[in-house]
Structures are given as C-alpha cells and as structure tokens.
C-alpha cells in the first residue's frame, strides 16, 4: 500500500543509521519528475536542512544543506542509475564523515557532513514519486 | 474530496474554452513546490505539449511548448500572485491568439499560440499540489 506524499517522519540519526526508501517515479523521464529527500533540524518543514537530496530523473542529482535559512554550496552529479517507470530502492547510510547513498544496492552518491547528523529531527520524502516503504534503522549499541 | 495527482483528462479545446483548476501547494514556498499544467497532443504523457505552464511557487513561472519532442523558446515571468499555503483558482482561457491565465480572478500570464489549440487531446495537472477541482468548459455554439 502507498504512503502519503509528502511523507514526514520524526527521526534521530547517528553514525550507523540507515534511511531506506522504496518508490517509483510518477511520470516518464522525458517530463522530468523529481524526488526529494530532506533531513530537517526540526519537525517544521521551514527548518534548516542538514542533507538535501534531489533527483531530477534523467537529468541530475543535487545535494546541499540549508543553514540559518540559506542554501549553501550545491554538489551536483550526473550519475543516473534510476530507470524510467521502475521501482527504486534508495538507502542513505550515515558514515562517520559522510552520507552514502545507495540506489538499488549500488553506491551512487556521497555527501560530506556539514552539520552533525545528530541534529536531524525529521525526514521528509516528497515530489513526483509514489512511496511504498520508509524505514529508519538504528545501529544496535 | 481530492483528485488524484498527477491528474489526466481527455480534452478538446478551441477559442472560448476554459480550463479551471483549484488546488493548494503541498509545501511552504521556502521549499519551492511546483505546479505544472500540460496541454498534450495525445493521451500519452510522452506526446508533444501545446502549452506547458509550470509554477515554481515563490520564484517564477515558465511557459513553453514541446514540438516534435523538443522544447522550444521558454517564456518566463516573475509575477507571483499565488500565496503560501493558500488555495488557488487557476483558469486558462483559450483566446483567438493566445492562452490567458487567471489566478484568483486576476489576469496574470499570457502565452501566444504556437500550435492551434484544436491539437490538444489531453490535459495533465501534476507536481506538488493537492487538487480539488478540474473542469473544462466549452463555448456554447
């Protein structure tokens, strides 16, 4: 069954945590659907964003952070492992120095920590996708 | 009650027709939600687009056409009558020489015909909005 989009969930992250998302683009890549995942510092959507991950399907991925309301230096990748009309599994793992983004089991993007992941209080998944799974796994102590 | 998004409906347009859309942005303008309305030449989403209307809420509106698979010259407007978190009523009227776009009863954008409106077979409304009304009215002969 489908989860509502935008999908918002409270989350606490630290080294070893993984956010897993399963979904599917809602339009053909010719029409440039988007997927966005934002790690927020508060439960409010206007809050700062520790890790912003935006896919323009068929075009590019941009990653960034929003600090004190201002977007910082954007990181762009042309790597496009997502396929038109096909389900994807996206997992974002918190490593000691960076986020590692896996697409369908393959390491596809990385983003160095700018703000400590412990600052994250909420994850939002949204834009032009249907969403079937959202999970945050925590490292067993 | 809400209509599904993306929302697709078969439509025939000519001078005097009006497409009316009521909806609401799904995110605060700080996060740049989009609204897109596309007038297609076929029932397929990959088909050419006679009139492409895309709002990046809080930022800009772009209008264009997609002919033989290729995007043409984009028309951009910074006019932003939409309000953060508020319902909007959008009406697109087919005039003899252009489309006239009204937002909440105010004439806000125009786009000269590049392809005759009679070529339209389908309208799609999508991206980051909830949709409560979609209507195509035809001029009484």
């Amino acid at each position: 069954s489908l989860l509502p989009v935008p999908y918002t969930e409270a989350a606490s992250l630290s080294t070893g945590s993984t956010v897993t998302i399963k979904g599917r683009p809602l339009a053909c890549f010719l029409n440039e659907p988007y997927l966005q995942v934002d790690f927020h510092t508060e439960m409010k959507e206007e809050s700062d964003i520790v890790f912003h991950f935006q896919v323009c399907f068929g075009r590019r991925v941009v990653m960034n952070s929003r600090e004190y309301g201002a977007w910082k230096q954007q990181v762009e990748s042309k790597n496009m492992p997502f396929q038109d009309g096909q389900e994807f599994e996206l997992s974002i793992s918190v490593l000691p120095d960076k986020y590692q983004v896996m697409v369908n089991g393959q390491s596809s993007y990385t983003f160095d920590h700018r703000i400590k992941p412990e600052a994250v209080k909420m994850v939002q998944v949204w834009r032009d996708i249907s969403l079937t799974k959202f999970n945050v796994s925590y490292l067993k102590r | 009650s809400l209509l599904p998004v993306p929302y697709t409906e078969a439509a025939s347009l000519s001078t005097g027709s009006t497409v009316t859309i009521k909806g609401r942005p799904l995110a605060c303008f700080l996060n740049e939600p989009y609204l897109q309305v596309d007038f297609h030449t076929e029932m397929k989403e990959e088909s050419d687009i006679v009139f492409h209307f895309q709002v990046c809420f809080g930022r800009r509106v772009v209008m264009n056409s997609r002919e033989y698979g290729a995007w043409k010259q984009q028309v951009e407007s910074k006019n932003m009558p939409f309000q953060d978190g508020q319902e909007f009523e959008l009406s697109i009227s087919v005039l003899p020489d252009k489309y006239q776009v009204m937002v909440n009863g105010q004439s806000s954008y125009t786009f000269d015909h590049r392809i005759k409106p009679e070529a339209v077979k389908m309208v799609q409304v999508w991206r980051d909005i909830s949709l409560t009304k979609f209507n195509v009215s035809y001029l009484k002969r």
């Epitope: 053909c28 890549f29 068929g58 790597n79 396929q83 096909q86 | 033989y68």
Partner: nanobody, 121 residues
Framework: ELQVVESGGGLVQAGDSLRLSCAVS????????MMWFRQAPGKEREFVAA???????YCANSVKGRCTISRDNAKDTVYLQMNSLKPEDTAVYFC???????????????WGKGTLVTVSS
C-alpha cells in the same frame, strides 16, 4: 523515424582506449534517451551505458570507471569512450534510442547495425 549508425570500432590492444560514435538522423533526436549495448559471440546482448535526453548518465558495473558516455545534440551524435580495454570487451557494440530511460534491450525503439570492437592481448 530515427536512423542510427555506429562507427569507430576496430582492432585495439589490451589497455588501449577507443571512442565509438553513434550518428542519429531524425528531428526528434534530442528527446530520445540513448544507450549502448554489446554482444559477444555466443552471448546475450548486454547493457553498457546510457545517457538520458537531459544528460544524466550511467555505466554498467562491467565498465564502471572505464566508461564515459556523452552526447552532442547539435550534431545528433552520441559517444562512448572506453578506456583500459580488456580482451573480454571484445564484442559488437550497438547504439539504441528509446523514449524510456531503461537498461533493457527489449525496451529500445531504434537500433543501429553495430560496430565490431576486437581487443587483442
């Protein structure tokens, strides 16, 4: 209708580089996603690389780190650069066009006839 014609194949030494070209004729080239596949003798056709209409790219694991795919929409041409070639890269290389960005040969709309690449050790 699109016509697809590959060129640039030939005999090369292991460790060398090669650039394959794919010329496409048809006014809708810019809206097609372009793919390279290859077929070794007696094997299935396999995906090598893709470039979306808007420039996103992907290379298969078998060529990752050795492959660059690019397109020039003004020249209606797609390029596949292959570095550090190995004997197992020997195959007929096919260029294909699709309205869907997928890595599945059955989803392609148009195919070229292929160009043979032979890598000798």
């Amino acid at each position: 209708e699109l016509q697809v014609v590959e060129s640039g194949g030939g005999l090369v030494q292991a460790g060398d580089s090669l650039r394959l070209s794919c010329a496409v004729s048809g006014r809708t080239f810019s809206s097609y996603h372009m793919m390279w596949f290859r077929q070794a003798p007696g094997k299935e056709r396999e995906f090598v690389a893709a470039i979306a209409w808007r420039g996103g790219t992907y290379c298969a694991n078998s060529v990752k780190g050795r492959c660059t795919i690019s397109r020039d929409n003004a020249k209606d041409t797609v390029y596949l650069q292959m570095n550090s070639l190995k004997p197992e890269d020997t195959a007929v290389y096919f260029c294909a066009a699709s309205l869907r960005y997928v890595f599945d040969p059955s989803a392609m709309d148009y195919w070229g006839k292929g160009t043979l690449v032979t890598v000798s050790s």
